[in-house]
């Protein structure tokens, strides 16, 4: 059956032979209605990429550099399955390109000019493409030929396989730049030996090189890693201090109509029958005909790449930056130490309009990027399409797991002028009911619930975390009879109460009328039994403070809070009747942009923050008539974090633990991708 066939692309006679053997052996173990293999032979990996894009083939396995080519338009391919190395219990699908130095040296990443460098080889990922790509814009002009620019940047190097006649400085530390193990400084171990012997000041290798060459921890402690933020870390901390994370070997397919489920079904069956130590007659990860045919011989198996993970996320911002710099050879005109405009990520249409107004008032220091969901915004910040946004604590957690860092906190209670330097304790997550109802925390089953959005702190993580520990399952849509929790599956009972309008029904953005704090409260007013919101929501939307038709006549005393002990209290008593304390919303950014974002925002709030008194005729950053656009409307200022500059430190151990527990109930495709 053609639609059940995976057309594998082979790039040599030997690969084609192995592919035919793969096809025949799969036929013998799979049912006739299962997936099948067909083989397509092409002259090169690039031809395979084009063939898949043109629907003449379906799959091929590629190295990282080629995954980048596959992702570029017009190919638009995406990673669908990753080879893994190491054990099934601790599968490695990536390696980290690192810059290793001796501990007793005293320079940082931005001080490499004039140092001596050790490389694995010319044109190799960890040893050349990544470090030179990331340093590209610091190289002296003209940057072409690249070898000459690099020779003029470092004071001496060993770059195996470079042309020692044309670029003698690249071979200064290893005369002749031998391109094999005859050169003692060749490849990973060689580049590390070049550093160890004192020939070079820095070695560009993979994270595992140090461990493979120095079994003794005391010896490893004589070395450190250079981080991109111009700090150093121990060699064990490579996950937090690397030049780029590089995928090892990856199966790619079309982004649309790519048969990814079928490819996974095929490869999953293949590894069961013909994986490591499974079969004598055919082996997926070796071949008598040659090395690394179709798949790497060193692979131990396959893992399915999460569906939310596109090529940009898979390759990572640093890797793409490095390769793009090398390929396109373009550098920003502004010096790299000068802050470029900050691209704010706006959620849907209403936030985009406010962001546009901010952009005009900032004279272009702020630019705007849009996405339909918070997770899409986080992904855009990760891949460099946007730079920053302010997030609820639940999304600060997801952003943190995806490598972003908190930059500034929204403060709600501290008056100026101390606001900017004050660390607030957070706000209260509360459960609000109508005073006329007889509901308590203990009899919510079967009632109608209203939530700010799935994954948010007061509206979801805190109440559902508490509920989970009571009911011990994740079927919250069965616990409540119906509700509105924007971001739930469209057919879920937790979308039933949402108001839309139609195409935006239950979407986690302002197009859904019951989204956010004000939306969840409106849902309670109009349809629900309980709303999970922040403690300020009721006072902010009653007593005429919200002029919208649905809210203008509401009275504060018509609503009460549910306490965890089964009692109820006035909305004026959140300190004695709340579900938990929630961390304030915070601005997040990529590490490389954090300082610029902080500097610019502190400057912007001085002009457009809460010191502006007349918001009817001036732009106000923290105002949007109860809609909480870009920032919460009750923000007094954005405050410095001081040492709370990681998501764990910012959110606090207790909250991180609560959200981690709730992860077994997670419906976050982004979180799944970021923890792959």
């Amino acid at each position: 059956v053609p639609e059940k066939s995976v057309r594998w692309c082979a790039v040599s006679e030997h690969e084609a032979t192995k592919c035919q053997s793969f096809r025949d052996h799969m036929k013998s173990v799979l049912p006739s209605n299962g997936p099948s293999v067909a083989c397509v032979k092409k002259a090169s990996h690039l031809d395979c990429i084009r063939a898949i894009a043109a629907n003449e083939a379906d799959a091929v396995t590629l190295d990282a550099g080629l995954v980048y080519d596959a992702y570029l338009a017009p190919n638009n391919l995406k990673p669908v399955v990753a080879e893994f190395y190491g054990s099934k219990e601790d599968p490695q699908t990536f390696y980290y390109a690192v810059a290793v130095v001796k501990k007793d040296s005293d320079f940082q990443m931005n001080q490499l000019r004039g140092r001596k460098s050790c490389h694995t080889g010319l044109g190799r990922s960890a040893g050349w493409n990544i470090p030179i790509g990331l340093l590209y814009c610091d190289l002296p002009e003209p940057r072409k030929p690249l070898e000459k620019a690099v020779a003029n940047f470092f004071s001496g190097s060993c770059v195996p396989c470079a042309d020692g006649t044309d670029f003698p400085q690249l071979c200064q530390l290893c005369p002749g730049c031998g391109c094999s193990t005859l050169n003692q400084y060749f490849s990973y171990s060689g580049a590390f030996k070049c550093l160890k012997d004192g020939a070079g000041d820095v070695a560009f290798v993979k994270h595992s090189t140090i461990f493979e060459n120095l079994a003794n921890k005391a010896d490893r402690d004589q070395y450190e890693l250079l981080c991109l933020d111009n700090t150093r870390k121990s060699v064990d901390e490579y996950k937090d201090c690397h030049l780029a994370r590089v995928p090892s070997h990856t199966v790619v397919a079309r982004s649309v109509g790519g048969k990814e489920d079928l490819i996974w079904e095929l490869l999953n069956q293949a590894q069961e029958h013909f994986g490591k130590d499974k079969s004598k007659e055919f082996q997926l990860f070796s071949s008598p005909h040659g090395k690394d045919l179709l798949f790497k011989d060193s692979a131990h198996g396959f893992l399915k790449v999460p569906p939310r993970m596109d090529a940009k996320m898979y390759l990572g911002y640093e890797y793409i930056t490095a390769i793009r710099n090398l390929r396109e050879g373009t550098c920003p005109e502004a010096p790299t130490d000068e802050c470029k405009p900050v691209k704010w990520c706006a959620l849907s249409h209403h936030e985009r309009l406010k962001c546009d107004e901010w952009s005009v008032n900032s004279a272009g220091k702020i630019e705007c990027e849009s996405a339909e969901t918070t997770e899409d915004c986080i992904a855009k910040i990760m891949n460099g399409e946007a730079d920053a946004m302010s997030l609820d604590g639940g999304f600060v957690y997801i952003a943190g797991m995806c490598g972003l860092v908190p930059v500034l906190a929204e403060n709600y209670n501290t008056p100026n002028p101390n606001c900017e330097n004050t660390a607030e304790e957070g706000y209260f997550a509360v459960a609000v009911v109508k005073s006329s109802s007889d509901l308590t925390w203990d009899n919510l089953k079967g009632k109608k619930s209203c939530h700010t959005a799935v994954g948010r702190t007061a509206g979801w993580n805190i109440p559902m975390g508490l509920l989970y520990s009571k009911i011990n399952h994740c079927r919250f849509d069965e616990f409540f009879s119906e509700g509105c929790a924007p971001g739930s599956e469209k057919n879920s009972s937790l979308c039933k109460l949402c108001m839309g309008p139609s195409p935006n029904l239950c979407e986690p953005n302002n197009k859904e009328g019951y989204y956010g704090y004000t939306g969840a409260f409106r849902c309670l007013v109009e349809k629900g039994d309980v709303a999970f919101v922040k403690h300020q929501t009721v006072p902010q939307n009653t007593g005429g403070k919200n002029p919208d038709a649905w809210a203008k006549n509401l009275k504060e005393e018509d609503y009460e809070l549910l306490c965890l002990d089964g009692s109820r209290k006035s909305v004026q008593e959140p300190a004695n009747c709340h579900l938990a304390r929630a961390p304030n919303h915070a601005v997040v950014a990529r590490k490389d942009k954090a300082d610029c974002v902080q500097t610019l925002l502190l400057d912007q709030q001085r002009m457009f923050g809460s010191s502006v008194t007349d918001c009817s005729s001036n732009f106000c950053l923290f105002e949007s008539k109860t809609k909480d656009l870009l920032f919460r409307d009750d923000t007094v200022c954005l405050a410095k974090l001081h040492d709370r500059n990681t998501y764990e430190k910012y959110l606090g151990e207790e909250y991180v633990k609560a959200v981690t527990n709730l992860r077994k109930c997670s419906t976050s495709p982004l979180l799944e991708a970021c923890t792959f």
Partner: nanobody, 117 residues
């Protein structure tokens, strides 16, 4: 809500010029920021240029150096002078004010600009 009426669009050859006007009924003097947006078929509406009451302006990268936004508070009007027009400038152009703080989704009829030889 201030009512806004756009005019001045038309058909123009590449390299030509047009001047769009946006007249407000009611006072725009109290309105801080005004913006010109455009929407080409099948594309998202995008900010082309904006101006604050104090005269701070901002332009989309694609129109910098070719378009100029200005406002006449006495006449309650905002203008967009478009020079060196290109085929990719073809779109319906809308004017908006940000006065409501609701960041509404209410737009006028717009004015069609077509750049074609």
């Amino acid at each position: 809500q201030v009512q806004l009426v756009e005019s001045g669009g038309g058909l123009v050859q590449p390299g030509g010029s047009l001047r769009l006007s946006c007249a407000a009924s009611g006072s725009i003097f109290s309105i801080n920021t005004m913006g010109w947006y455009r929407q080409a078929p099948g594309k998202q509406r995008e900010l082309v240029a904006g101006i604050t009451r104090g005269g701070t302006t901002n332009y989309a990268n694609s129109v910098k150096g070719r378009f100029t936004i200005s406002r006449d508070n006495a006449k309650n009007t905002v203008y967009l002078q478009m020079n060196s027009l290109k085929p990719e400038d073809t779109a319906v152009y809308y004017c908006t004010d940000y006065s409501s703080r609701y960041y509404h989704d209410y737009w006028g009829q717009g004015t069609q600009v077509t750049v074609s030889s």
